[in-house]
Interface confidence: low
């Protein structure tokens, strides 16, 4: 069941084919639910758009690394 009361489980069914510039990214979440077909990363852009990405791709790992190193802690 969801971990929060009435919280939906967010899943990614397809990944973006395009590399996204880190300057456009605000934050990320790493989705690991067994209720989802794929392990995924959801990037949130500076204009609040959410994009599904493949955590096995190097640009995705580099982008997460970049966001980790930022001192601020934006809420997704």
């Amino acid at each position: 069941q969801p971990d929060a009361i009435n919280a939906p489980v967010t899943c990614c069914y397809n990944f973006t084919n395009r590399k996204i510039s880190v300057q456009r990214l605000a934050s990320y979440r790493r989705i690991t639910s067994s209720k989802c077909p794929k392990e995924a990363v959801i990037f949130k852009t500076i204009v609040a758009k959410e994009i599904c990405a493949d955590p096995k791709q190097k640009w995705v790992q580099d982008s997460m690394d970049h966001l980790d190193k930022q001192t601020q802690t934006p809420k997704t």
Partner: antibody, heavy 115, light 111 residues
Framework: SLEESGGDLVKPGASLTLTCTAS??????ICWVRQAPGKGLEWIAC????????TYYASWAKGRFTVSKTSSTTVTLQMTSLTAADTATYFC????????????WGPGTLVTVSS | ALVMTQTPSSVSAAVGGTVTINCQAS???????MAWYQQKPGQPPKLLIY???SLASGVPSHFRGSGSGTQFTLTISDLESDDAATYYC????????????FGGGTEVVVK
């Protein structure tokens, strides 16, 4: 639900393998956390859900501890060169919908290292 | 390493009272990935709060999590005898070096 097994009394320098069994056919990420008697919690390692089986270890656990997925419902923790400092209750825990917290824990299994 | 400093180590309060537990991270916790767990003797920990302030399923609403960055707080109001337990904070930091850090624990005694 989750259940650990394999805890035992072993001598220093010995090896031991613990098993975590999940009741469902699939699970989220499974992590191992230990707790020495009367002490706090200490993260050891995690293994990814799905077919990728990505593994993540605490820096102190690398090399001596190995986490593996042995079936669709079981995850093991292999421990080598055990010392008295490894005496603890070992818990397996399932992550939530994100990787960052543990929403379900097993009851734990006790490992005692003593000569 | 991600080090979580939890205070106080022990606190006592009366039924109906309020307890506040603080947790300070050695580095900023990304996306406020802070959780709080309750543990009773002989039992495994139980998730109370995740992502700093989200209440886990089945957890009573008198538990409240707050904070961001490096400073986080668990507040237990309208204290009940069943709340007597040890509470742990736990932070998660970074993709490149996945790491969980647990606080040292706070024992809550209900009078």
């Amino acid at each position: 639900s989750l259940e650990e097994s394999g805890g035992d009394l072993v001598k220093p320098g010995a090896s031991l393998t613990l098993t975590c069994t999940a009741s469902e056919l699939d699970f989220y990420w499974i992590c191992w956390v230990r707790q020495a008697p009367g002490k706090g919690l200490e993260w050891i390692a995690c293994i990814g859900a799905g077919s990728s089986g990505s593994t993540y270890y605490a820096s102190w656990a690398k090399g001596r501890f190995t986490v593996s997925k042995t079936s669709s419902t079981t995850v093991t923790l292999q421990m080598t060169s055990l010392t008295a400092a490894d005496t603890a209750t070992y818990f397996c825990a399932r992550t939530g919908t994100e990787f960052t917290y543990y929403s379900l824990w097993g009851p734990g299994t006790l490992v005692t290292v003593s000569s | 390493a991600l080090v979580m400093t939890q205070t106080p180590s022990s606190v006592s309060a009366a039924v109906g009272g309020t307890v506040t537990i603080n947790c300070q991270a050695s580095q900023s916790v990304y996306n406020n990935n802070m959780a709080w767990y309750q543990q009773k003797p002989g039992q495994p920990p139980k998730l109370l709060i995740y992502t700093a302030s989200s209440l886990a399923s089945g957890v009573p609403s008198h538990f409240r999590g707050s904070g961001s960055g490096t400073q986080f707080t668990l507040t237990i109001s309208d204290l009940e005898s069943d709340d007597a337990a040890t509470y742990y904070c736990a932070g998660y930091k970074s993709y490149s070096n996945d790491e969980y850090g647990f606080g040292g624990g706070t024992e809550v005694v209900v009078k």
